[in-house]
Interface confidence: low
C-alpha cells in the first residue's frame, strides 16, 4: 500500500481551523492479525529524507495522536488531552486519515507528516509516510480562508518501506 497526500501546501490565516489529510492507497489486508497504526508528527525537511525527524504537534507526541485498528475501519482520537490542545486525528472507512488543528497560530507553521505502520503481528511491518507544509499567515496578505495546493503526482505518493 501507499500513502497519498492530496495537498502538499496549506496556507491559512491565523485563528482558522485546518484539516490536514493523508490517504491510504492500494490493497489493504483486513486480516485478523493485521493492525494499522496511524499517527501525525511535525518534522523538518531533512537533507536525506523528509519526515525522518519526529517532533510533537502542540506538545503532543505521536503516541498521544495515534489511531490503531484493522484494515479500513474508522477511528478517531477521543483523548481529552488532544482536544484540549485543539487537535483531533481521525480515520474513515475509505482510507482517509486526517488531523484537525483548531485556532491556528503562527507557531503552527511547518512541515507535518502522517505515518502509517502496518503490523502483521509477530511477523513483519511496513511503514509509509506523507508530508505536507502548513503556512499560517497574519496581516493584510493573509487569505480569508485556508487555501490548499494539490500535490504534484510524484509528491502525492511519498513512500518509505521498513
Amino acid at each position: 500500500f501507499k500513502v497519498a497526500t492530496p495537498y502538499s501546501l496549506y496556507v491559512c490565516p491565523e485563528g482558522q481551523n485546518v484539516t490536514l489529510t493523508c490517504r491510504l492507497l492500494g490493497p489493504v489486508d483486513k486480516g485478523h492479525d493485521v493492525t494499522f497504526y496511524k499517527t501525525w508528527y511535525r518534522s523538518s525537511r531533512g537533507e536525506v529524507q523528509t519526515c525522518s525527524e519526529r517532533r510533537p504537534i502542540r506538545n503532543l507526541t505521536f503516541q498521544d495522536l495515534h489511531l490503531h485498528h484493522g484494515g479500513h475501519q474508522a477511528a478517531n482520537t477521543s483523548h481529552d488531552l488532544a482536544q484540549r490542545h485543539g487537535l483531533e486525528s481521525a480515520s474513515d472507512h475509505h482510507g482517509n486519515f486526517s488531523i484537525t488543528m483548531r485556532n491556528l497560530t503562527l507557531l503552527d507553521s511547518g512541515l507535518y507528516c502522517c505515518l502509517v505502520v502496518e503490523i502483521r503481528h509477530h511477523h513483519s511491518e511496513h511503514r509509509v509516510h506523507g508530508a505536507m507544509e502548513l503556512q499560517v499567515q497574519t496581516g493584510k496578505d493573509a487569505p480569508s480562508n485556508c487555501v490548499v495546493y494539490p500535490s504534484s503526482s510524484q509528491d502525492s505518493e511519498n513512500i518509505t518501506a521498513a
Partner: antibody
Framework: QVQLVQSGAEVKKPGSSVKVSCKAS????????ISWVRQAPGQGLEWMGG????????NYAQKFQGRVTITADESTSTAYMELSSLRSEDTAVYYC?????????????WGQGTLVTVSS | DIQMTQSPSSLSASVGDRVTITCRAS??????LNWYQQKPGKAPKLLIY???SLQSGVPSRFSGSGSGTDFTLTISSLQPEDFATYYC?????????FGQGTKVEIK
Amino acid sequence: QVQLVQSGAEVKKPGSSVKVSCKASGGTFSSYAISWVRQAPGQGLEWMGGIIPIFGTANYAQKFQGRVTITADESTSTAYMELSSLRSEDTAVYYCARSSYGWSYEFDYWGQGTLVTVSS
Amino acid sequence: DIQMTQSPSSLSASVGDRVTITCRASQSINTDLNWYQQKPGKAPKLLIYAASSLQSGVPSRFSGSGSGTDFTLTISSLQPEDFATYYCQQNRGSPITFGQGTKVEIK
C-alpha cells in the same frame, strides 16, 4: 513466541548508575512499545517509562525524568534502561515489558526481571 | 497523574469461591484498563485488557467489567493456582499507573 531476556543482577553504590538490557526475540521489535516497570521489595508495580523503537524517542514518568534514560537498538532488538544517581530506595526488581498491540501500553510479554541492589 | 485505587488490599478465600476485586480511577479512563496476576518471584501476567477482553490462554473463570472510573475483576470459581496478587493498570494517559495490588490468600 516472543521472549524478552534481561541482563543479570547488579549491586551498585549510591550515586552510581546502572544500565539494564532487554533483548527481544521471536517477533517484530520496532513497532511495539517496550516499557520498564520496577517493583521494590514487597511493593507494587511502578512504570518508569517506555520507548517505541521505530521512533527512538522515549516517554518517561515525571518521577524519573532526568534520572532515567531508555534507549533501543533496532539492529540487535535490544532495549536499555539506565538509571543514574542511584539511592537505596532504587533497590528493586526491574522488568522490561512489551505491549500487545504496537503503541498501546498493555503488557503481554515480560522479561524475567533484573534485581538491582543499591548499597554502600 | 491518574491514580488507581484497588480494594480490598487483601482477601482470604477458599477454592471454589467467587472473588471480586475492584479498581477505581481518579478520572475517566474509558475502558483503557488492564488486569495482571503476579505470583511471588515471577513477572506479572496479563489477564484482561481493555477492561473486559480476556487475554489469549487465560482461563474463562477470569472476567473483567466496567468503564469510566469503576472496574471489576471477577474470578468465578477460585482455583488453587489463582492465589496471587492482582494489579489493575490504566493505559489511558501517561504516566501509566498501577493499582497498589490485591493479595488473594488461602482461607
